[in-house]
């Protein structure tokens, strides 16, 4: 058993059936020695007297507030909270597994730039009595500070007979150095407990393996004289690194027919503009990553060719 | 050329070269579906690496107050990577196939730190730790993990020389 | 809209036999823990069974012990409750429930979604 925070309690269990579960002693937080009694959660059961209380507990129905009183006043709380373990392997039951980039990714972080700002997110279709806290640091074992916000719901999606429900939380490093190159991961712990349950989710990745640029911003076509070709020109996103001599993108330009099944002319260059040709009904897309290092590319930004 | 007493590397052309040794780090380990090779017991590999350190220089600020501090530093990794490149770790079992970018990723460490230091100045260069794994899967892991941080390292050297190209070049 | 709804309840006499049934329907419950609780004239409602999402752990109150089995159908979002050797004190109105999250509880207060009820009456 241990102290997630003041009065409040986790204690880990082997789950399984008819498990013999953890004995847990209470202690009443008084100065009385006598005529204390305890209660669990809004019973008014006697539970047992006494400045102790021992407990077995082996299930959710004996975690709950425990309450000790005295000539009915209430004298402290202790709440306690479970958090399994099933065949050595601490439950998961609070977060969806996303999948991607692989299986058991329950956060998934982005990060706009090198400014050493990020923003995890995750998913769950569990809709009430949920609270989540998140803490961060560049390395474990002499970890350097970085900040987290509160984790607010960000997204309410309807995914067949379910609602799925996303959070996410803003972090920032404190001393970021965006032109170093990063030895130690940034590791991102989050605190889920849904009613009585704890569990803990963790993250351990470097910045720049979660880059992933803005959209190119300011798209505009300029038709050549006596030609089908045009000019597209672009600008790097506001939000990206500078300066831009440093903090080079590369980008990717797409000519894309109205239908998904046409071929796709790509061109990758280094500038911000692009001589293209424009089919009728087709539209231009331009996307961008990080020159020299291959993290994710961003969303397209697109206008039409006509 | 960079010389330790202070001229100016020839910054276009280091810029190109870094650029393709970007390419190449990618070409030699693309990201295979996000292997995550931090699980696999990193420190005793990638702890001894030279990393390009907040304060190397090696920032736009850095590089224009003095860009020496900064060269040295790509220099000593540079050497670093080179030697491991051409160790046991690269050249034994498994063999690495014919067409594999690794060989032209070694020969690019080398020309761009010889750009950096001609013939005659030495830079300290940093010691190699003695990795010799015994066994073939665990020197395939160790190529993995060695490009991966060998990718972050080039990464900011690109940008380094890009900078300097485009800022500090006469 | 997210509905339980209880059936299988009626007057029997002490001894017999009843199984209960509740639909869960609006919304997917194959994660969720499923419970049943009952309530007499006059007093507060109390756990009597619940199960958790997969069908393998189940909670009892001791009062119903070794006489009363819950059970899902995860297929068909039902989750039933065999009630045998029935005593004039399991006369009540009994509550289907259920609760996100996989596992059961034993408080009321826990449980997201409530039927409206069905009458079981034991009649010595």
């Known amino acids: 058993i241990w102290e997630l925070k003041k009065d409040v309690y986790v204690v880990e269990l082997d789950w399984y059936p008819d498990a013999p579960g953890e004995m847990v002693v209470l202690t009443c937080d008084t100065p009385e020695e006598d005529g204390i009694t305890w209660t669990l959660d809004q019973s008014s059961e006697v539970l047992g007297s006494g400045k102790t209380l021992t407990i077995q507990v082996k299930e959710f129905g004996d975690a709950g507030q425990y309450t000790c009183h005295k000539g009915g006043e209430v004298l402290s709380h202790s709440l306690l909270l479970l958090h399994k373990k099933e065949d050595g392997i601490w439950s998961t039951d609070i977060l969806k597994d996303q999948k991607e980039p692989k299986n058991k990714t329950f956060l998934r972080c982005e990060a706009k730039n090198y400014s050493g700002r990020f923003t995890c997110w995750w998913l769950t279709t569990i809709s009430t009595d949920l609270t989540f806290s998140v803490k961060s640091s560049r390395g474990s074992s002499d970890p350097q500070g970085v900040t987290c916000g509160a984790a607010t719901l960000s997204a309410e999606r309807v995914r067949g007979d379910n609602k799925e429900y996303e959070y996410s939380v803003e972090c920032q490093e404190d001393s970021a150095c965006p032109a170093a190159e990063e030895s130690l991961p940034i590791e991102v712990m989050v605190d889920a407990v849904h009613k009585l349950k704890y569990e803990n989710y963790t993250s351990s990745f470097f910045i720049r393996d979660i880059i992933k640029p803005d959209p190119p911003k300011n798209l505009q076509l300029k038709p050549l004289k006596n030609s089908r070709q045009v000019e597209v020109s672009w600008e790097y996103p506001d939000t990206w690194s500078t300066p831009h001599s440093y903090f080079s993108l590369t980008f990717c330009v797409q000519v894309q027919g109205k239908s998904k099944r046409e071929k796709k002319d790509r061109v990758f260059t280094d500038k911000t503009s692009a001589t293209v040709i424009c089919r009728k009904n087709a539209s231009i897309s331009v996307r961008a990553q990080d020159r020299y290092y291959s993290s994710s590319w961003s969303e397209w930004a697109s206008v039409p060719c006509s | 050329r960079a010389v330790p007493g202070g001229s100016s590397p020839a910054w276009t052309q280091c810029q190109q070269l870094s650029q393709k040794l970007c390419t190449l780090a990618w070409s030699a380990h693309p990201l295979v579906g996000h292997m995550d090779l931090r699980e696999e017991g990193d420190e005793e590999t990638t702890n001894d690496v030279p990393h390009i350190q907040c304060g190397d220089g090696c920032d736009p600020q850095g590089l224009r107050d003095n860009s020496q501090f900064c060269l040295q530093r790509i220099h000593q990794g540079l050497i670093f990577y080179e030697k491991l490149l051409g160790s046991d770790i690269f050249t034994g079992e498994p063999s690495l196939l014919p067409d594999s970018p690794v060989g032209q990723l070694h020969a690019s460490l080398l020309g761009l730190s010889q750009l950096l230091q001609p013939e005659g100045h030495h830079w300290e260069t940093q010691q190699i730790p003695s990795l010799s794994p015994s066994q073939p899967w665990q020197r395939l892991l160790l190529r993995f993990k060695i490009l991966r941080s060998l990718q972050a390292f080039v990464a900011v050297a690109a940008r380094v020389f890009a900078h300097g190209a485009a800022t500090l070049s006469p | 809209e997210v509905q339980l709804v209880e059936s299988g309840g009626g007057l029997v006499q002490a001894g017999d036999s009843l199984r209960l049934s509740c639909a869960a329907s609006?919304?997917?419950?194959?994660?969720?823990?499923m419970g049943w609780f009952r309530q007499a004239p006059g007093k507060e409602r109390s756990f009597v069974a619940a199960i958790n999402w997969s069908g393998e752990l189940t909670g009892y109150a001791g009062s119903v012990k070794g006489r009363f089995t819950i059970s899902r159908d995860g297929v068909e979002n039902m989750v039933f409750l065999q009630m045998n050797s029935l005593v004039p004190e399991d006369t009540g109105v009994y509550y289907c429930a259920a609760v996100e999250g996989r596992d059961y509880y034993r408080g009321a207060q826990y449980y997201d979604y409530w039927g409206q009820g069905t009458q079981v009456t034991v009649s010595s």
């Open positions: 609006g919304r997917s419950f194959s994660n969720d823990a």
